[in-house]
């Protein structure tokens, strides 16, 4: 069964800066990745970035840099201030569209006990939805 993992890290040097990393553990070919915050995309969440392996990358503030790390993982740097700044309990979600597995989505947030600059290991997060 495919799995999606989500890792959220707050940068020690900039407390309003977050790095989100997501990965897909499956054998299929990824056709689209959508990163959102505030909940799953389409269920109250707001899209931060969309990454298409053959067409490119689209991002919206406060996303600063979305990129592919490998064929099956992505990272996103967020920088914000004021209303557009993420906070420690913000939920980030990643949805991977893959053939032939379909769409798989998982969410994560900053570990409650983590200090800035520390992060939880990138273990698979609970799968919230598989279309």
């Amino acid at each position: 069964t495919p799995e999606v993992w989500v890792q959220v890290r707050m940068e020690a040097t900039e407390l309003s800066s977050f790095t989100i990393r997501c990965g897909f553990l499956g054998s299929g070919s990824i056709s689209l990745v959508t990163v959102s915050w505030g909940g799953p995309n389409g269920a109250g969440g707001t899209t931060l970035a969309v990454l298409h392996p053959e067409r490119g990358i689209r991002q919206w503030a406060p996303a600063r840099q979305a990129r592919w790390e490998t064929q099956s993982s992505i990272s996103l740097i967020l920088e914000g201030s004021g209303a557009s700044s993420p906070c420690a309990n913000t939920t980030f979600c990643c949805k991977f569209a893959s053939f032939p597995e379909g769409s798989w989505e998982a969410c994560g947030s900053l570990p409650p006990s983590s200090d800035p600059g520390l992060s939880a290991p990138p273990t698979p997060a609970p799968i919230l939805r598989a279309d």
Epitope: H52, R55, T70
Partner: nanobody
Framework: EVQLVESGGGLVQPGGSLRLSCAAS????????MGWYRQAPGKDRELVAT???????YYVDSVKGRFTISRDNAKNSLYLQMNSLRAEDTAVYYC????????????WGQGTMVTVSS
């Protein structure tokens, strides 16, 4: 399918300048890496310069200080300002785009000829 169309090539004297442009058909997504390559007659295609959508730039040593690569993300357009041109810069210049930055799918333009001659 991303289409790339170059323009701006031509004949120029040594020491002169040219500005190449490359327009991409993709208007929704940013192309992660865009670059210029060139192929001189009888030689292999070689990298000239690349730029990511976040602005990271790379130049091959032979053009550093003479060529400037830039891009307009809003238009997904790529530019190459070429100054102090030399005879050895004569080549067909190709625009290249790697949307993911991973090389999974790479697109090429048809090329534009630059001739440096007196």
């Amino acid at each position: 399918e991303v289409q790339l169309v170059e323009s701006g090539g031509g004949l120029v004297q040594p020491g002169g300048s040219l500005r190449l442009s490359c327009a991409a058909s993709e208007t929704y997504f940013d192309l992660y890496v865009m670059g210029w390559y060139r192929q001189a007659p009888g030689k292999d295609r070689e990298l000239v310069a690349t730029i990511t959508y976040t602005g990271s730039i790379y130049y091959v040593d032979s053009v550093k200080g003479r060529f400037t690569i830039s891009r307009d993300n809003a238009k997904n357009s790529l530019y190459l300002q070429m100054n102090s041109l030399r005879a050895e810069d004569t080549a067909v210049y190709y625009c290249n785009a790697d949307p993911s930055g991973l090389g999974r799918k790479v697109y090429w333009g048809q090329g534009t000829m630059v001739t440096v001659s007196s």
